[in-house]
Interface confidence: low
């Protein structure tokens, strides 16, 4: 942190404060966090910066800082001020920054702020302000930053803002505002950033944002909006829009038609059920679009003019088909997540040349054709789990040189094409009960993790015979750490000197890794030595029937022989 106070004895430096020249023949004075209950008296007329933050000052007298005509920044944050009288800042002609946050003010000190013509930044946040008088900012012609967040406002002080034409950034967050009326910010033509998050806003006037010609950032997160904020249509320069954590149920057609510059939209944590097909058209700067659980969407959105999208997540809807031209609209797509939909048939994704990750789990897909994923040279991860895939073309994966993760678990596969999959590190085929053939480890030289339908199929990956005993003892689950292992099995090594136990276990772990570098599940075990011999209920029932019949025949023979003799 900053160096401790040196209590420099300069003329005009109050006791215990830290003072230093500011390089312009003026003085910077830091009297923060000293437990002061009143303003220091012997301040130099040449003071340019005065920090009185985090003291116990509860009141200011009129004209408490006489003749500080060079003062540019005054910090009174974190005191106990409940009221600031008229004339408290008289004569501070150069004042640019005034910090009054973290006090106990109940309304904006209108009279005290009059004629601070040079003021550029005013901090009034973290007070108890419930009232902002209509003319309170009228003399603040240079004001650029206004902080009113974390107060007790219940409405937008429309009249008070009329005079702030130079304002660039304002926050009204963390208040109790419930409505924004038409033309609430009508004169704020220079405003670039407006924060309204963490209020109780439930309704917006149709023209509430009119006049905000320069606005680039609008934060409406954490409010009670139950309708899409259509009033944003006039914000032609809007780049960042947040309305997450509200109660919005639908996004209408052409929702962002007036906001062609949007780069980011945050709208998660809303109970969105419906989205108009044209809602996200013509947003050339948009990079990410995420929509989870919009259950009434039945058609894939029309994303004409939103060609720079890099990530599209549209999960938990009822989309049953994708347009054949989906990739023509989205040539820059890198991540596509359409999990938990009703997709049956897939188009060819080959025009989406930049795709790196596709997630299509939990759909109704029944077939993977030869051209579905053809020539996706950047594709690294493909998730097709929990579908109804019974047929995969032998060359479906033959042109995916970057593919390292493939999940086909819980489908209806009876065979599995290996062409082109030699780079895989993760392969999941569990839950395909008809897939009973063995897969050779030689086809997957890079494999680290494989999940198969049956334990015996892991034998090809070096986890059979003695290995399964160790595997079962030491690798009970993916997440069991060596720490758990030490606790569970340290008793096995009582003879081992305790000082060496840690080293021994670490060596043992290395030996284990060398023994089978492929993690295959389910692991073969004493009760699953060769499950394929007794696989399927028909075979099992047949064997049991034979045993029972054999037993009955033996019994009859025994009885027969007994009678005979």
């Amino acid at each position: 942190g900053s160096s401790p106070r040196s209590g420099v004895l300069l003329r005009g430096c109050p006791t215990h404060c830290h003072c230093e020249p500011d390089g312009r023949m003026l003085l910077r004075v830091d009297c923060s966090d000293l437990g002061l209950s009143e303003l220091p008296s012997n301040l130099s007329v040449f003071t340019s910066y005065l920090d009185l933050s985090m003291n116990n000052i509860s009141q200011l007298l009129p004209n408490p800082l006489p003749s500080l005509r060079f003062l540019e920044e005054l910090r009174l944050a974190g005191n106990a001020l409940t009221y600031i009288p008229k004339g408290a800042f008289t004569g501070l002609y150069s004042l640019k920054v005034l910090m009054l946050q973290n006090n106990q003010l109940r309304h904006v000190p209108t009279e005290a702020l009059q004629n601070l013509r040079s003021l550029q930044s005013l901090r009034l946040d973290a007070n108890h302000i419930s009232y902002v008088p209509p003319s309170c900012f009228s003399g603040l012609h240079s004001l650029r930053h206004l902080w009113l967040d974390d107060n007790a406002l219940t409405e937008i002080p429309v009249q008070a803002f009329r005079s702030l034409s130079a304002l660039q950034a304002m926050t009204l967050a963390l208040n109790k505002i419930h409505h924004i009326p038409d033309y609430a910010f009508g004169n704020l033509s220079s405003l670039v950033v407006l924060h309204l998050h963490n209020n109780r806003i439930h309704s917006l006037g149709k023209k509430c944002f009119d006049g905000l010609h320069s606005l680039e950032t609008l934060d409406l997160n954490y409010n009670n909006l139950d309708e899409f904020p259509t009033a944003i249509r006039t914000l032609s320069n809007l780049k960042e829009l947040g309305f997450h954590s509200n109660n919005i149920r639908s996004i209408p057609e052409k929702a962002f038609v007036g906001n062609p510059s949007l780069i980011t939209i945050h709208f998660y944590d809303n109970p969105i059920q419906f989205v108009g097909r044209s809602a996200f058209q013509h947003l050339p700067e948009l990079r990410t679009l995420t929509l989870n659980g919009a259950s009434q969407i039945t058609e894939f959105p029309d994303l004409t003019g939103t060609a720079n999208l890099e990530s599209l997540t549209l999960t938990g809807a009822q989309i049953s088909s994708l347009p054949q031209t989906v990739c023509n609209q989205l040539p820059n797509l890198q991540v596509l997540d359409l999990s938990y939909n009703l997709l049956e048939d897939l188009p060819s994704f080959s025009v989406c040349q930049k795709l790196q990750k596709i997630d299509l789990r939990h759909n109704e897909i029944y077939e993977i054709k030869v051209d579905t994923f053809q020539q996706l040279l950047s594709l690294r991860s493909l998730n097709l789990a929990w579908n109804k895939i019974a047929i995969i073309h032998p060359n479906a994966f033959s042109t995916l040189p970057s593919l390292i993760k493939l999940d086909l678990s819980s489908n209806l596969l009876s065979s599995f094409p290996i062409t082109g999959l030699h780079g895989l590190t993760h392969l999941k085929l569990t839950g395909n009960h008809a897939l009973q053939s063995l897969i050779s480890s030689e086809n997957f030289p890079e494999l680290k993790v494989i999940e198969m339908p049956y334990a015996y199929q892991c034998c090809a990956f070096g986890v059979c015979e003695n290995a399964y005993k160790i595997s079962n003892q030491w690798n009970k689950g993916d997440n069991s750490s060596m720490d758990d292992l030490h606790k569970k099995d340290a008793g096995m090594f009582q003879a081992q000197d305790e000082r060496d136990l840690e080293d021994f276990l670490l060596d043992f772990e290395e030996d284990l890794k060398a023994l089978h570098s492929v993690q295959c599940s389910p692991s073969p075990g004493p009760f699953k030595p060769c499950e394929h011999l007794l696989d399927g209920w028909l075979i099992r029932i047949g064997v049991m029937a034979l045993i029972v019949l054999g037993g009955v025949a033996g019994l009859l023979l025994f009885i027969g022989l007994g009678i005979f003799f």
Partner: antibody, heavy 121, light 112 residues
């Protein structure tokens, strides 16, 4: 004098989580936001997120969204940063720092001493 | 978020002045005065040298000054001293992402 004292160095395995604490001295903890910044070996500073203790609501860098959780306990003047699904590239010194003017755009005027987190299998 | 652009290294002799630049965009450096500068010696935590563009915290030498023009902020150190040798980082607030961004850092070497 404000002081931020962080918990000690940690060695973690890939896939696990780490929780670093930052205890503030002085009576002004709740009024200020606390940020977390990390620095990988030989690399620059990277902002992870921050929290305003008196509201308990946190803000995270997009890169860490979903993987980092920042909390604060006003009663003990302590902030916490938990990072999950650790990977080797998360090996870094993690700093907590105080936002000097209490809000997120302001500068970090006081810093903790840093906590080295090493992620290694 | 894209990091702010700083020169990787600068150097100067004792007594000289040097300037380190920090270039951003209209949404970070250009919009606000929320540009801050930090000094970091090896193995130590960063130390705030300039905040809000041009203000110095108590205890920081007046040899350090900050300024801004358009989308570029600058840190100037006059009368270079051996103890000024360190890494320097700029930081800004990005009004688009509501996030904080740092520059890549500049290594200052004091010659001789």
């Amino acid at each position: 004098q404000v002081q931020l004292v962080q918990s000690g160095a940690e060695v973690k395995k890939p896939g696990s989580s780490v929780k670093v604490s930052c205890k503030a001295s002085g009576r002004t903890f709740s009024n200020y936001a606390i940020g977390w910044v990390r620095q990988a070996p030989g690399q620059g500073l990277e902002w992870m997120g921050g929290i305003r203790p008196n509201f308990g609501w946190a803000k995270y860098a997009q890169k860490f969204q979903g993987r980092v959780t920042i909390t604060a306990d006003e009663s003990t003047s302590t902030a916490y940063m938990e990072l999950s699904s650790l990977r080797s590239e998360d090996t870094a010194v993690y700093y907590c720092a105080r936002y000097g003017q209490g809000h997120f755009p302001s500068a970090f005027d006081y810093w903790g001493q840093g906590t080295l987190v090493t992620v290694s299998s | 978020d894209i990091a702010l652009t700083q020169p990787a290294s600068v150097s100067g002799s004792p007594g000289q002045s040097i300037t380190i630049s920090c270039t951003g965009t209209n949404s970070d450096v250009g919009t606000y005065n929320y540009v801050h500068w930090y000094q970091q010696h090896p193995g130590k935590a960063p130390k705030l040298m300039i905040y809000d563009g041009s203000n110095r915290p108590s205890g920081v030498s007046n040899r350090f000054s900050g300024s801004k023009s358009g989308n570029t902020a600058s840190l100037t150190i006059s009368g270079l001293q051996a103890e000024d040798e360190a890494d320097y980082y700029c930081q800004a607030y990005d009004s688009h992402s509501f996030n904080i961004v740092f520059g890549g850092g500049t290594k200052l070497t004091v010659l001789g």
